[in-house]
């Protein structure tokens, strides 16, 4: 005869574990049903009655089969510099990612906790290291023979055009100006862009530049105290 299927709650055989989607209740000393994603345990099981599950309330969720007494709170609403890429539902937390032109300065398990704008390199400076989803742009001064005349988070320093006869010599922020004879170039004309996963910074914030001579350096500090705890609020 086939073995009889036990219905929850049931006492497990000594040395055996509860089945998939069941948990062992220490108080009842029985294998009991877990609650499905989107639910939580409203009443724990006893020796004679199984777990009673209830749906998560608004702005709360459970993503896994569980026996938690309360659902988890969804993270706070996405800020103005973020895009909600996954909504808060009963089965999943809200996920916020940075909008174009911003990078994730502080990640969390899923999505981003703090976005900051990508730096724009001013004229005379070009992109030394492009911004990524999780790192800022690094700018550097244009070396002799190169220039950048844009304020951009993607443009690198490009070579001055080579003139047969120079009318105005180039500098770090301006291309050379040739006399009417055709110039030759070591690179094709037009701005040179670096490929990067985040698009150029929007008009959301504007830099207020001050004079600059030193190349930009990234801030590498030793690990310190944790950042502030994340706020949690309903919709």
């Amino acid at each position: 005869l086939p073995a009889q299927v036990a219905f929850t709650p049931y006492a497990p055989e000594p040395g055996s574990t509860c089945r998939l989607r069941e948990y062992y209740d220490q108080t009842a000393q029985m294998c009991c049903s877990k609650c499905s994603p989107g639910q939580h345990a409203k009443v724990f099981c006893t020796k004679t009655s199984d777990t009673v599950c209830d749906s998560c309330e608004d702005s709360t969720y459970t993503q896994l089969w569980n026996w938690v007494p309360e659902c988890l709170s969804c993270g706070s609403r996405c800020s103005s510099d973020q895009v909600e890429t996954q909504a808060c539902t009963r089965e999943q937390n809200r996920i916020c990612t940075c909008r174009p032109g911003w990078y994730c300065a502080l990640s969390k398990q899923e999505g981003c906790r703090l976005c900051a704008p990508l730096r724009k390199c001013r004229p005379g400076f070009g992109v030394a290291r492009p911004g990524t989803e999780t790192s800022d742009v690094v700018c550097k001064p244009c070396a002799p023979g190169t220039f950048s005349n844009t304020t951009s988070s993607t443009d690198i320093c490009r070579p001055h055009q080579i003139c047969n006869v120079v009318a105005i010599p180039g500098n770090a922020s301006m291309d050379a100006v040739c006399t009417s004879t055709s110039p030759t170039r070591s690179m094709a004309p037009g701005a040179v862009h670096l490929p990067q996963p985040v698009s150029t910074r929007s008009q959301h914030t504007q830099p207020t530049p001050e004079p600059s001579t030193a190349p930009s350096t990234s801030f590498l500090l030793p690990m310190g105290p944790s950042p502030p705890a994340e706020g949690s609020t309903g919709d």
Epitope: A105, L106, L114, A116, R119, R122, D136, P207, T208, P209, E210, P211, S212, T213, A214, S216, T217, S218, F219, L220, L221, P222, M223, G224, P225, P227
Partner: nanobody
Framework: EVQLVESGGGLVQPGGSLRLSCAVS????????IIWVRQAPGKGLEWVST???????YYADSVKGRFTISRDLAKNTVYLQMNSLRAEDTAVYYC???????WGQGTQVTVSS
């Protein structure tokens, strides 16, 4: 060891001003960027302003024209001058290195009449 210590927070009426300070030890401001971030009650973190190693400054739209970030290299301190304060500026303000490896403990700013 690098440390960032904020000060200057307090209770102020709408339209008032405060100046926050972020004293940095163990790292030079001439080679590093500092940001100000805030967290309003029950809300997530919000970027406020950045001052880069070369003194270039950036501001969030919500504070542009009202807040000014500056620094004193001799004192290795970054300041956030906050004018025309509004109730929605109420938050804990933190300064951090732009790689966000190190944070200050925060200073509470409350704007209320």
């Amino acid at each position: 060891e690098v440390q960032l210590v904020e000060s200057g927070g307090g209770l102020v009426q709408p339209g008032g001003s405060l100046r926050l300070s972020c004293a940095v030890s163990g790292a030079s401001l001439s080679r590093n960027a500092i940001i100000w971030v805030r967290q309003a009650p029950g809300k997530g973190l919000e970027w406020v302003s950045t001052i880069y190693d070369d003194g270039e400054t950036y501001y969030a739209d919500s504070v542009k024209g009202r807040f000014t970030i500056s620094r004193d290299l001799a004192k290795n301190t970054v300041y956030l001058q906050m004018n025309s304060l509004r109730a929605e500026d109420t938050a804990v303000y933190y300064c951090a290195g732009s790689a966000f490896d190190f944070w200050g403990q925060g200073t509470q700013v409350t704007v209320s009449s």
